[in-house]
Structure formats: structure tokens, C-alpha cells
């Protein structure tokens, strides 16, 4: 049985330009201790979209649902979507360390942007 599951329930999300996009992610446990980060793309060239501890992400808001009893919600909302935001977004769990160690990624959610 896996110790940690990172679940991105939607394979794809389509949003009109100018609207907001909600990207859902739940994690089965806070243990191991460490942050959740959101990235666009995979591999060494991926772009950090949201990191709670560091950086400034004015268009990104956490929209967790704290009432979820059986898992932890780390969903985000990206406002004022433009075509440049299209891509696949990954919710990634890290284990705290020096530096933090990537443990597990969600399967990814592809964001497509429709014309207004």
C-alpha cells in the first residue's frame, strides 16, 4: 500500500480567456512533512506556479477545502487566464530537507484556453 497519494482528479480543464481556472489536488497525508508545490510542465525546464513558502504569485490563490476529512486539499485558482497559461500543471509533494526532496507528483491536469 502506498504511503502517500497525490491525486489530481481532472485530466483536463478548459477555461475561457480572462476567466479563472481551478486546478484540484488532494494529498492523502501530511506525512512525510514537507511542502506542496505546483508546476507547469515536467522535467528540468518546468515552471514553478505556486509555492507557499517563497516567491510572489499574485494570480494564484489556494482554494483548499478544509472540511475534507479523509485527505488534504491543495487546490489552487489561477485568475485572469491568458493563452500563455495553457499547459499541463502538476501538483508535487516534497519531503522537507536541505534541500527539499521531490517525493511524488500528481498525474497532471492539462489546461486549455478558449477564446473569450
Amino acid at each position: 500500500e502506498e504511503e502517500l497519494q497525490v491525486i489530481q482528479p481532472e485530466k483536463s480543464v478548459s477555461v475561457a480567456a480572462g476567466d479563472s481556472a481551478t486546478l484540484n489536488c488532494t494529498v492523502s497525508s501530511l506525512i512525510p512533512v514537507g511542502p506542496i508545490q505546483w508546476f507547469r510542465g515536467a522535467g528540468p525546464g518546468r515552471e514553478l506556479i505556486y509555492n507557499l513558502k517563497e516567491g510572489h504569485f499574485p494570480r494564484v490563490t489556494p482554494v483548499s477545502d478544509p472540511t475534507k476529512r479523509n485527505n488534504m486539499d491543495f487546490s489552487i485558482r489561477i485568475s485572469n487566464i491568458t493563452p500563455a497559461d495553457a499547459g499541463t500543471y502538476y501538483c508535487v509533494k516534497f519531503r522537507k530537507g536541505s534541500p527539499d526532496v521531490e517525493l511524488k507528483s500528481g498525474a497532471g491536469t492539462e489546461l486549455s484556453v478558449r477564446a473569450k
Partner: antibody, heavy 118, light 112 residues
Framework: EVQLVESGGGLVKPGGSLRLSCAAS????????MSWVRQTPGKGLEWVAT????????YYPSSVKGRFTLSRDNAKNSLYLQMNSLRAEDTAVYYC???????????WGQGTTVTVSS | DIVLTQSPASLAVSLGERATISCRAS??????????MHWYQQKPGQPPKLLIY???NLESGVPDRFSGSGSRTDFTLTINPLQAEDVATYYC??????????FGGGTKVEIK
């Protein structure tokens, strides 16, 4: 019904060792993060140790790190706390607690008393 | 370490009235829009029992006269109306990702 039953407490001299056990039933033990929390009249509740559902990750406060070791046997639905180099300040009631998400302590056992005294 | 300061240390409230307990954290316990603050009830001779998880969520089976509120560093547990069986000591607990996890010193609730 969730049940957590601690055992192994007792009187031990300073510098001695004890092994506490917690027998779990009524839930899927292997899916739960497990912890020990202790309670003393003077210091109230104090988190002692936590282990991930599969046993890979363990966490301790500085007050017990290097002296206490937490382990689990998911096949036996059991949790163990090996306590070495015991000190008078380790005297407390030790509770076993379960947590599905590793956030709050959802269920607690009745506790087992550890007394460290010469 | 994140220090949790509960006030008052003890509280006497008339049956049917409101009891309010405060817990202040030395730094924020919020992560990703969720407050990792929890409340427990402990009656004499018994282990603690979870009442409220993540600041404001009522644990299953807990009467709805218990409620929790707050965010970041300031949290409140409210019992309204107070019943005789609510006589107990109440503890707050934080489980943010900054170890160690800590508890407040407790608030003893009695009947006036």
C-alpha cells in the same frame, strides 16, 4: 469501533529502557499515521513521536530524539516505542494516537504510565 | 517552536451560557488556506478526544454546541450552550509543517 490499547509502562531507573506497545483494532491500521503523545501534570500534553503509514518516515521532538525509536508492524496492527536512556522528566502517561491525514490526532488509547525514578 | 498560549487557564460558566476559550499561536499555523489548529476535550481519568479539526470542522459525533473559529495565530473554541457533561479540560494543538507539533497549556471549564 476503533480501539488503541497501550502496554509496557512501568517503573524504571534513570538510564534504563522500556518498550511501549500499542495494539490497534477497528480500522485499517496500515492506512494511518500513528503517534505517541505524553502527558505530565507539570507540562501538560507533549508530542513524542510520529510514524508514517508504511513506516518509512519517523519524526521526534528534540527532547526525545536519539533516545526514543518509533516503529510499527502493519501485519500485526501494532505500534512500538523503544525508550532508552530514560530520565526523570520522561515520567508521564503515554498515549498512542492515530491520524488518517497526519494532521489531528483522531483517536487515542487509554494510556500507559511510565515512571522514571531511582 | 510554535508556542500555543491558551486563555483563560480556568473558566466557570453557568449552565446554558456560552463558554469561550482562546488559543494564540506565536506564529501562523496556516498553510495553503487551511489552519492546522485542532481542539481536544479531556475529562478526568480519560484520554483526550478530538472535537474540532483544522480550526472550524466539527469531528463526527461531536455535538454542534461546540464550534471553532479563527485563522493564522488567533483561534477560539466556543461551547454554547454549556451542558453539565462539558466540564473538562480543553486543549488546542497545532500541526503545521514546522516541527515540533505543540499543544496549549489547557483550559479547565467548570460550572458556575
Amino acid at each position: 469501533e476503533v480501539q488503541l490499547v497501550e502496554s509496557g509502562g512501568g517503573l524504571v531507573k534513570p538510564g534504563g529502557s522500556l518498550r511501549l506497545s500499542c495494539a490497534a483494532s477497528g480500522f485499517t491500521f496500515s492506512s494511518y499515521v500513528m503517534s505517541w503523545v505524553r502527558q505530565t501534570p507539570g507540562k501538560g500534553l507533549e508530542w513524542v513521536a510520529t510514524i508514517s503509514s508504511g513506516g518509512t518516515y519517523t519524526y521526534y521532538p528534540s527532547s526525545v530524539k536519539g533516545r526514543f525509536t518509533l516503529s510499527r508492524d502493519n501485519a500485526k496492527n501494532s505500534l512500538y516505542l523503544q525508550m532508552n536512556s530514560l530520565r526523570a522528566e520522561d515520567t508521564a502517561v503515554y498515549y498512542c494516537a492515530s491520524s488518517l491525514t497526519g494532521s489531528s490526532f483522531d483517536y487515542w488509547g487509554q494510556g500507559t504510565t511510565v515512571t522514571v525514578s531511582s | 517552536d510554535i508556542v500555543l498560549t491558551q486563555s483563560p487557564a480556568s473558566l466557570a460558566v453557568s449552565l446554558g451560557e456560552r463558554a469561550t476559550i482562546s488559543c494564540r499561536a506565536s506564529e501562523s499555523v496556516d498553510l495553503y488556506g487551511t489552519s492546522f489548529m485542532h481542539w481536544y476535550q479531556q475529562k478526568p481519568g480519560q484520554p483526550p478526544k478530538l472535537l474540532i479539526y483544522r480550526a472550524s470542522n466539527l469531528e463526527s459525533g461531536v455535538p454542534d454546541r461546540f464550534s471553532g473559529s479563527g485563522s493564522r495565530t488567533d483561534f477560539t473554541l466556543t461551547i454554547n450552550p454549556l451542558q453539565a457533561e462539558d466540564v473538562a479540560t480543553y486543549y488546542c494543538h497545532q500541526s503545521s509543517d514546522e516541527l515540533p507539533w505543540t499543544f496549549g497549556g489547557g483550559t479547565k471549564v467548570e460550572i458556575k
